[in-house]
Interface confidence: medium
């Protein structure tokens, strides 16, 4: 069964700057990745970035840099200042659309006791939805 993992990390250099990493553990080819915060996309969450293998990347504040890390994983850096910046308990969700598996989404947030610059290794997060 495909799985999605989500890792949220606070940067040591900027205490309110976050890096979100997400990956898809499946054999299909990824056609779209959507990163949102505040909940799943389409269920109260707000889109931060959309990554498409051919059409490129679109991002909205507070996203600062979204990029592909591998063919099946992405990273997103969030700017660390301003009223729309994330806080420690913000939930981030990643939705991967792949063929032939369909859409898989998981969410994660900063571990409660994480030190700046540290984070738990990326482990599969609970799958919230499979379309």
């Amino acid at each position: 069964t495909p799985e999605v993992w989500v890792q949220v990390r606070m940067e040591a250099t900027e205490l309110s700057s976050f890096t979100i990493r997400c990956g898809f553990l499946g054999s299909g080819s990824i056609s779209l990745v959507t990163v949102s915060w505040g909940g799943p996309n389409g269920a109260g969450g707000t889109t931060l970035a959309v990554l498409h293998p051919e059409r490129g990347i679109r991002q909205w504040a507070p996203a600062r840099q979204a990029r592909w890390e591998t063919q099946s994983s992405i990273s997103l850096i969030l700017e660390g200042s301003g009223a729309s910046s994330p806080c420690a308990n913000t939930t981030f969700c990643c939705k991967f659309a792949s063929f032939p598996e369909g859409s898989w989404e998981a969410c994660g947030s900063l571990p409660p006791s994480s030190d700046p610059g540290l984070s738990a290794p990326p482990t599969p997060a609970p799958i919230l939805r499979a379309d």
């Epitope: 056609s31 779209l32 707000t46 059409r55 490129g56 909205w60 504040a61 301003g82 009223a83 729309s84």
Partner: antibody, heavy 123, light 111 residues
Framework: EVQLQQSGAELVKPGASVKLSCTAS????????IHWVKRRPEQGLEWIGG????????LYASKFQDMATITADTSSSTAYMQLSSLTSGDTAVYYC????????????????WGQGTSVTVSS | DIVLTQSPASLVVSLGQRATISCRAS??????????MHWYQQKPGQPPKLLIY???NLESGVPARFSGSGSGTDFTLNIHPVEAEDAATYYC?????????FGGGTNLEIK
């Protein structure tokens, strides 16, 4: 010439649904986002949502997430917006608009607009 | 959501004079050297028309008497010299984050 042709005026009853269309010509609909914007009488403009027709990816304002459904048919160069559970507050002119050609430079400005579709919700 | 406050709500300007419309954002709409603020003109019975994108870039086909400036939270649309056909409602719109929002509009009357 770039054009967005919208469907005609609609008179619908409260609680009903309506589906508006926006047909593009003069450009490839797959090269852009198509957005929908609401203008109520004597009020300003409100962004409802948008779609990337090439891949079907949609974006919505949270206010409209439950009532608006945006789709596109690239074969006919047409974008659609369905509005459900309509109330008198949804009486408005609805515009579709083309975003500047898809680009990582993040313009997100709407450079061509349809003529608007008037929707009246009344019993 | 970012709130855009336009002022004045209405403006009367003599033909050939300068019209200045202000748009203030509730937080900065500038990042990485870009200001994600755009200006539109709307006449009665017509759809909005893009005038200025990214704060200061004149849209193709728009007369050079229109100009935009500003960064951060404060932006200005200038029209000089004003012509009779400029009578319309003007809106600012940001696109820095989702959802994009519009200002309340400024109604420009020419005398």
């Amino acid at each position: 010439e770039v054009q967005l042709q919208q469907s005609g005026a609609e008179l619908v009853k409260p609680g009903a649904s309506v589906k508006l269309s926006c047909t593009a010509s003069g450009f490839n609909i797959e090269d852009t986002y198509i957005h929908w914007v609401k203008r109520r009488p004597e009020q300003g403009l409100e962004w409802i949502g948008g779609i990337d027709p090439a891949i079907g990816n949609t974006l919505y304002a949270s206010k409209f997430q439950d009532m608006a459904t945006i789709t596109a048919d690239t074969s006919s160069s047409t974008a659609y917006m369905q509005l459900s559970s309509l109330t008198s507050g949804d009486t408005a002119v609805y515009y579709c608009a083309r975003e500047r050609v898809y680009s990582n430079t993040l313009y997100y400005a709407m450079d061509y607009w349809g003529q608007g579709t008037s929707v009246t919700v009344s019993s | 959501d970012i709130v855009l406050t336009q002022s004045p709500a209405s403006l009367v300007v003599s033909l050939g004079q300068r019209a200045t419309i202000s748009c203030r954002a509730s937080k900065s709409v500038s990042i990485s050297g870009y200001s994600y603020m755009h200006w539109y003109q709307q006449k009665p019975g017509q759809p909005p028309k893009l005038l200025i994108y990214l704060a200061s870039n004149l849209e193709s086909g728009v007369p050079a008497r229109f100009s935009g400036s500003g960064s951060g939270t404060d932006f200005t649309l200038n029209i000089h010299p004003v012509e009779a056909e400029d009578a319309a409602t003007y809106y600012c719109q940001h696109s820095r984050e989702l959802p994009p929002t519009f200002g309340g509009g400024t109604n420009l009357e020419i005398k």
